[in-house]
């Protein structure tokens, strides 16, 4: 059996509004006073096992003590009333849990949604946290009939237990109640049909058109409450590799439909589509997006010819020469399909021409020393591109006109080239480049630029600290002009090694030092200057700076019969590198001099 408590705390279930004051009282039973020889002045109040300061406690009479708390902020406090029996033994009399919080705010932003195939779900903003157990009840009624209450589990939403009835207005509101108060939201009045969120369209399919390479036809199935609702659509698409969606103008898809033709697309390009729907009045909610579906536009003939160039090999005897025609595969955006082959036509005169069908990107032909015209077209299954035309002049013709003010410079991790055009109208420019090396041949890459371009960057994969030989050739209707070349670096570094110095001639008071240029593979940049450091075993180190065009230097004012240590360093814009140390000894006497 339970022992009777020695007294009670009132109120027994205290709930306090945060920030307010609160007073509790402890009343001791008469029998308890006599048993323990105590009165209310023996009471010790505790919160969470810590004694309450005396100034908060008031002894009302021999049986009753009160405690007052100001500005209550803790969410939950264990409050106990205890007595000191026999002077020092603390005995618990009674305990309560004191809760603090707020009365519920008036719920706001009440909205309801009817997910197709499910019951109505309403959501609201409960306002500030109450820190107390608060019941939220969704109420709904017709003008003449109440619906079952919906008890919210989470306090922010509730799904009603009944199926919605369409085309009849319903009134909905929320009641919030806790120990500190009760409040109702504003009510909302609506027809559930205007709150429908349809299921996403499905069976989205994409088909292309052989007639038009710029369109794709979409078809899909919409539900719309089993055909009860007319739905309008929202269509978005993107290319397969893009991350941002392109919007089909909503005004184009306003009328109820289950198919649509998307226009102005690029040929032979894979597009991804998605679609969603909403009641055609625009009331309610957009469905979730459908599953994505993709399709590829039909091929179109290539939109431009490939970049086209040639290289001439030395002539075999004098009767004919070998010419290597080279071109670049078209990017997908210009190929507009799978390139099947290339048609090359070489014409010597009106009566002499030869046609080749080539699957690769080069063709070597043998030509006499006459002038030829080469044309090149790319072909896919739809048709041929326009032709790129190159005039291959006779080797006896000297190329006139070249670009001027040719410059190259690195910027934004790219190697830029710029020039001033020649004074004669240009058809196009050819840029060629390769890595200069003493260990490997200069393997050229190249690119073509339009006649209007006079600044571009090299579009290959360039390496840092490699010396690039860059050549720019203007091409005219009559053939190539003169070529201009320069050297450039994408990014310089300090040289891989410094110069190896040696003595060319040593005199009593001077020495001629000589060195070889650092091989281009080790330069890692433009060698701007050299420094020569020299010292004796006991003397101070001397340093002289030498221009990079020199390969020898004379040290003067040297001491005779002295060992010198010399070292050279080479510097690029990015730093220097020392070569090995070299020693030499000056003679005691000059030549012909006697002691």
């Amino acid at each position: 059996q339970l022992l009777e408590p020695c007294g009670y705390i009132y109120p027994e279930f205290p709930v306090v509004q945060r920030g307010s004051n609160f007073t509790a009282i402890c009343v001791l039973k008469e029998a308890c006073l006599q048993h323990y020889y105590v009165n209310a002045s023996y009471i010790v109040w505790k919160t969470n096992h810590a004694a309450v300061p005396r100034e908060q406690v008031t002894v009302i009479n021999r049986t009753t003590s009160s405690v007052t708390f100001t500005d209550v902020v803790l969410p939950s406090v264990q409050l106990t009333c205890n007595i000191l029996s026999f002077g020092q033994i603390e005995q618990n009399v009674y305990g309560v849990t004191m809760l603090s919080g707020f009365p519920p705010d008036k719920p706001t932003n009440l909205t309801c949604i009817v997910n197709e195939g499910k019951n109505m779900l309403c959501q609201w903003d409960p306002g500030r946290e109450t820190y107390l157990e608060t019941n939220y009840t969704l109420k709904s009624e017709w003008a003449t009939e109440k619906f079952p209450d919906c008890q919210s589990k989470h306090g922010t939403s509730c799904m009603v237990s009944y199926m919605p009835t369409y085309y009849v207005n319903i009134e909905v509101w929320v009641e919030a109640e806790n120990a500190l108060g009760k409040v109702s939201s504003e009510s909302i009045n609506f027809d559930p049909v205007d709150k429908v969120k349809p299921t996403p369209p499905y069976n989205l399919s994409v088909t292309n058109s052989e007639e038009l390479s710029s369109i794709l036809k979409l078809s899909w199935v919409s539900s719309g409450l089993g055909g009860l609702l007319d739905l309008k659509s929202d269509i978005q698409y993107r290319t397969k590799d893009a991350s941002t969606w392109i919007q089909v103008p909503l005004e184009d898809t306003m009328s109820p439909r289950t198919s649509f033709t998307v226009q102005d697309l690029k040929p032979f390009t894979e597009y991804v589509f998605r679609i969603r729907s909403i009641k055609d009045s625009g009331k309610g909610y957009w469905s979730d997006w459908s599953e994505e579906a993709s399709g590829t536009t039909y091929e179109d003939r290539p939109s431009r010819p490939p970049s086209f160039w040639y290289k001439t090999n030395p002539s075999h005897g004098q009767e004919y020469r070998s010419v290597r025609l080279i071109w670049k595969a078209l990017p997908l955006s210009e190929a507009n399909g799978k390139i099947l082959d290339y048609e090359v036509i070489l014409t010597q005169s009106k009566s002499v021409s030869q046609t080749y069908t080539v699957t690769g990107t080069e063709l070597t032909v043998n030509l006499t020393n006459d002038r030829y015209v080469a044309s090149l077209a790319a072909r896919n299954k739809v048709g041929k591109s326009a032709a790129a035309v190159l005039t291959i002049p006779s080797p006896h013709v000297t190329a006139a006109y070249s670009v001027v003010n040719l410059k190259a410079f690195p910027k934004d991790n790219l190697l830029w080239v710029e020039w001033t055009p020649p004074p004669k109208p240009v058809s196009k420019y050819i840029l060629e480049w390769c890595v200069l090396s003493e260990n490997a041949p200069c393997v050229e890459d190249w690119q073509q630029e339009d006649a209007t371009v006079n600044r571009t960057h090299l579009r290959g994969r360039l390496l840092e600290s490699k010396c690039y030989q860059i050549t720019v050739t203007p091409v005219f209707a009559t053939g190539p002009g003169g070529s201009e070349s320069l050297k450039a670096y994408l990014k310089q570094a300090a040289p891989a090694r410094g110069p190896t110095v040696r003595t060319k001639k040593v005199g009593k008071n001077e020495a001629v030092l000589a060195w070889d240029q650092i091989p281009v593979d080790d330069q890692n940049g433009f060698i701007r200057n050299y420094s020569i450091s020299y010292r004796t075993s006991v003397g101070k180190e001397m340093v002289v700076h030498v221009d990079s065009s020199h390969t020898e230097y004379t040290l003067s004012s040297l001491s005779s019969d002295t060992l010198y240590m010399v070292r050279m360093a080479a510097y690029t814009d990015e730093g220097g590198k020392d070569g090995p140390e070299f020693t030499f000894t000056t003679p005691k006497f000059a030549q012909g001099e006697i002691e």
């Epitope: 009767e319 004919y320 030869q354 043998n366 006499t368």
Partner: nanobody, 125 residues
Framework: QVQLQESGGGSVQAGGSLRLSCVIS????????MGWFRQVLGKEREGVAA????????VYADSVKGRFTISQDSSKNTVYLEMNGLKLEDTGMYYC??????????????????WGQGTQVTVSS
């Protein structure tokens, strides 16, 4: 690799006829034109006749005009030289040749890159 194989040579009486054949193989792109050349011991190789593989244009040495005819069968990759009214001076080694040089049909031997092994033609009285 490119190969040219001649056949059809032999001995014939003056005024007689022979038909030489040349089968070509190994070309990535067909030659621009093909020719027949002959060489008499101790003399330079001379052009006899040539034909374009595309349009069939022909050219002949003055010494054989009206007597020799060059023709081709593209489907068989074969070039023929029909020789009528053979003379003693037509005796020699006959070579088939091919070129990829793009120019007008010619019997300039310096324009030809590929040669056969030759077939002997002997005309006797």
């Amino acid at each position: 690799q490119v190969q040219l194989q001649e056949s059809g040579g032999g001995s014939v009486q003056a005024g007689g006829s022979l038909r030489l054949s040349c089968v070509i193989s190994g070309f990535t792109y067909r030659p621009t034109f093909m020719g027949w050349f002959r060489q008499v011991l101790g003399k330079e190789r001379e052009g006899v006749a040539a034909i374009t593989t595309g349009g069939g244009s022909t050219v002949y040495a003055d010494s054989v005009k009206g007597r020799f005819t060059i023709s081709q069968d593209s489907s068989k990759n074969t070039v023929y030289l029909e020789m009528n009214g053979l003379k003693l001076e037509d005796t020699g080694m006959y070579y088939c040749a091919a070129t990829t040089v793009i120019t007008s049909v010619s019997i300039n031997r310096n324009l030809y890159q590929y040669w056969g092994q030759g077939t002997q033609v002997t005309v006797s009285s």
